[in-house]
């Protein structure tokens, strides 16, 4: 399955020198996210059709059994560590989403857009994450996990796993804001 | 394209058969998904199993079928469907289908293979 | 989780005339909903999927309509060829399930 973001066994060779105010960006980007994160929730759950936009809490609850866990009381190496982790596991799962949405819905444009527009974020945000990981931390491999691979489920466990998921980002973005 | 199935024949009530569905000009390695179906004499389709060939291996049963039919895949070009506890109930046509993302239709069909259980 | 019930079970029909199939779900399979004709001692093949769609070389004469819980198979201008068990198949979800095909129509 498609992986839009890939991390590489970074070591903390970077090519660009990181941006200045690299912390600000990182919380720019997680706001950004924020703000976009419940419109593309219910973008996804309309697009699904029924019996989705009524069952929500039963069909897109954020029960994610192995998704990464962050807590927001860490230092700052320990949480930017947890959310490269988020990070890939997020990017991944949006490319199985879009992957599949592109065959259960293809005349569903803006819901591709808004699912290709926050994968694009996301991926600036991971690079900004190892940027700041390698610079002030000389952490350059962080052990990942990545979204459930959706390939080989019918069309009702698709829906459900990425209505699941989008739940999920659109509760943990909100945790992820503040913690920065 | 074709599927073939194989390994159907006499079998005694409480037996086990193991059948083969084997693919020729595709292999099972892209998005697809092959699928068991039986049919007893003068019958309706009876949807059995599927599994996705993929390297996830995600298998999906009907009800009545969980416990007692095993489907895998054992090579790239063949899958199997394990029968246990046989009874005369499933006397009956065996076919494979395949079916391509996002698995919603059996395009292609093997012309199936007849298992009698008989004492 | 989606069963299928079909009716009739069995109709005859004349030359040139106009057959209509229906099919249910129990619950919303979205479109996806697929249709099959079968002849004795043949393999089913595939005539229709995503409720309207015809499969690839099957007469225009078969259409399919439908979406959520209802669809129809409507065969126009019947052949004698045609005489054969129809069944529909739902594939929006293969969990929990007993049968994704209704019980045929012939």
């Known amino acids: 399955s498609p992986l839009p973001i890939t991390p590489v066994n970074a070591t903390c060779a970077i090519r660009h020198p990181c941006h200045n105010n690299l912390m600000n960006q990182i919380r720019s980007q997680l706001a950004q996210l924020n703000g976009s994160a419940n419109a593309l929730f219910i973008l996804y759950y309309t697009a699904q059709g029924e019996p989705f936009p009524n069952n929500l809490d039963k069909l897109c609850g954020p029960n994610v059994t192995d998704f990464p866990p962050f807590h927001a009381n860490g230092t700052e190496k320990a949480k930017l560590v947890e959310l490269y982790r988020i990070v890939v596991y997020l990017g991944t799962s949006l490319g199985n989403i879009t992957r599949d949405q592109k065959i259960l819905n293809p005349s569903a444009l803006s819901l591709h857009s808004k699912l290709n527009a926050t994968a694009d974020i996301l991926r600036g945000l991971l690079s900004n994450v190892l940027c700041r990981l390698c610079s002030k931390y000389h952490v350059g491999h962080v052990d990942v996990t990545y979204g459930p691979d959706t390939s080989g489920k019918d069309v009702f466990q698709k829906k459900k796993l990425g209505c699941q998921l989008l739940g999920k980002y659109k509760q943990i973005i909100a945790v992820l804001a503040q913690a920065f | 394209e074709q599927l073939v199935e194989s390994g159907g024949g006499l079998v005694q009530p409480e037996g086990s058969l193991t059948l083969t569905c084997k693919a020729s000009?595709?292999?099972?390695?892209?998005?697809?998904?092959i699928c068991w179906v039986r049919q007893a004499p003068g019958k309706g389709l009876e949807w059995i199993a599927c599994?996705?060939?993929?390297?996830?291996?995600?298998t999906y049963y009907a009800n009545w079928a969980k416990g007692r039919f095993a489907i895998s895949k054992t090579s790239s070009t063949t899958v199997t469907l394990e029968v246990t506890s046989l009874t005369a109930a499933d006397t009956a046509t065996y076919f494979c289908?395949?079916?391509?993302?996002?698995?919603?239709?059996?395009?292609?069909w093997g012309p199936g293979t007849l298992v009698s259980v008989s004492s | 989780t989606p069963e299928m019930t079909q009716t009739p079970a069995s109709m005859e029909v004349a030359v040139g005339g106009t057959v209509t199939i229906k099919c249910q779900a129990s619950e919303t399979i979205s479109g996806y909903l697929s249709w099959y004709q079968q002849k004795p001692g043949q393999r089913p093949k595939l005539l229709m999927y995503r409720a309207s769609t015809l499969a690839s070389g099957v007469s225009s004469r078969f259409k399919g309509s439908g979406s959520g819980t209802q669809f129809t198979l409507t065969i126009s201008g019947v052949e004698c060829a045609d005489a054969a068990t129809y069944y529909c198949?739902?594939?929006?979800?293969?969990?929990?399930?007993?049968?994704?095909f209704g019980g045929g129509t012939e």
């Open positions: 000009g595709i292999d099972f390695s892209s998005n697809y998904w």
């Open positions: 599994i996705y060939v993929g390297s996830s291996g995600d």
């Open positions: 198949q739902q594939g929006y979800s293969y969990s929990d399930t007993d049968n994704v």
């Open positions: 289908a395949r079916t391509v993302e996002p698995y919603d239709n059996l395009h292609f």
